[in-house]
């Protein structure tokens, strides 16, 4: 994902009839004007803000990469939700790209978990039942998997 968020520039709005501690904030879907007096809407499909804020700019919407599908579009209050295509997954330690799921387990192991958009297939040793972090499966004996379909946000 190319998360093109603008730096969340913040400011303190001028003190004018502050009836509440949060009067200088704008609602989700907006950002504050430079003089701190007005709230300006984010542009639908282009940028967004998710919380009450004093940002000078809304955050730019994420564009889903090739190899990803768009689960839900960007609105003025929520970023795009992207998900890895079927047969690929995104790991927590390498969230920048979708990796191909393994097609099966190494010899002596059985598959206990399917490929999902956020996890590779899960293999355990037949006897001990311990998990295998595993690289490539052994050529001789593989158990094929069917890709899973649950949704996972990756913004």
């Amino acid at each position: 994902i190319t998360q093109q968020d603008l730096a969340p520039q913040q400011r303190v709005a001028p003190q004018q009839k502050r009836s509440s501690p949060s009067e200088g904030l704008c609602p989700p879907g907006h950002h504050i004007s430079e003089d701190g007096r007005d709230c300006i809407s984010c542009k639908y499909g282009q940028d967004y803000s998710t919380h009450w804020n004093d940002l000078l700019f809304c955050l730019r919407c994420t564009r889903c990469d090739s190899g990803e599908v768009e689960l839900s579009p960007c609105t003025t209050t929520r970023n795009t939700v992207c998900q890895c295509e079927e047969g690929t997954f995104r790991e927590e330690d390498s969230p920048e790209m979708c990796r191909k799921c393994r097609t099966g387990c190494p010899r002596g192991m059985v598959k206990v978990g399917d490929c999902t958009p956020w996890s590779d297939i899960e293999c355990v040793h037949k006897e001990s039942g311990t998990k295998h972090s595993g690289e490539a499966p052994a050529v001789e004996e593989t158990v094929t998997s069917s890709p899973g379909t649950p949704a996972s946000p990756c913004s």
């Epitope: 609602p27 989700p28 879907g29 639908y44």
Partner: antibody, heavy 119, light 107 residues
Framework: QVQLVQSGAEVKKPGASVKVSCKAS????????LHWVRQAPGQGLEWMGW????????KYNEKFKDRVTITADKSTSTVYMELSSLRSEDTAVYYC????????????WGQGTLVTVSS | DIQMTQSPSFLSASVGDRVTITCRAS??????VAWYQQKPGKAPKLLIY???TRHTGVPSRFSGSGSGTDFTLTISSLQPEDIATYYC?????????FGGGTKLEIK
């Protein structure tokens, strides 16, 4: 169902103040912004300000800033709009209206409260 | 403040007619425009937001279009129950402002 029920009509003298209430029901009070919009007889609509019960955020239209005060009682899910130093041109129907925490359009409106300012 | 200029102010049309109301903003408001219908003695009702998105329960004969400064509300086939005053509103920058209204009458 969502309801915004406003207080009854008021007749006030110039220079006086008026306080109009708007009781919300049918939704979670702290999740929506409540606004006040007024409409003078035969005229268009004019946004006055908002109150967000979720964080007590208040914003006023600069035009009314010195004369309007918006408050709320969360225990009764009621928002109030007080307008002071009334003049004849403040004669109008005052509406409360609701908006989700996003784009500033109003999906539900109260029935309106007629405030007449006359000596 | 952004001025919203509606035209025409009054419009007379027959049942079944295609009716178009326009709204011009004094500066660019992107697509942040809503349309409301108001019947005499009643509160306004939301019809359209984000210039072209119909609110829940609004008949498909109502449609909106436009971006930047020029916006249009269209009723594809006028029905007797559509007799009302219609208002545009910009929700781009506070203070949010409304057009002066278009009163729609049956010929």
């Amino acid at each position: 169902q969502v309801q915004l029920v406003q207080s009854g009509a008021e007749v006030k003298k110039p220079g006086a103040s008026v306080k109009v209430s708007c009781k919300a029901s049918g939704y979670t009070f702290t999740e929506y912004i409540l606004h006040w919009v007024r409409q003078a007889p035969g005229q268009g609509l004019e946004w006055m300000g908002w109150f967000y019960p979720g964080n007590n955020n208040i914003k006023y239209n600069e035009k009314f800033k010195d004369r309007v005060t918006i408050t709320a009682d969360k225990s009764t899910s009621t928002v109030y709009m007080e307008l002071s130093s009334l003049r004849s041109e403040d004669t109008a129907v005052y509406y409360c209206a609701r908006h989700e925490q996003g784009p500033g359009y109003f999906d539900y409106w109260g029935q309106g409260t007629l405030v007449t300012v006359s000596s | 403040d952004i001025q919203m200029t509606q035209s025409p102010s009054f419009l007379s049309a027959s049942v079944g007619d295609r009716v178009t109301i326009t709204c011009r903003a004094s500066q660019d408001v992107n697509t942040a425009v809503a349309w409301y219908q108001q019947k005499p003695g009643k509160a306004p009702k939301l019809l359209i937001y984000w210039a072209s998105t119909r609110h829940t329960g609004v008949p498909s004969r109502f449609s909106g279009s436009g971006s930047g400064t020029d916006f249009t509300l269209t009723i594809s086939s006028l029905q007797p129950e559509d007799i009302a005053t219609y208002y545009c509103q910009q929700h781009y920058i506070t203070p949010w402002t409304f057009g002066g209204g278009t009163k729609l009458e049956i010929k």
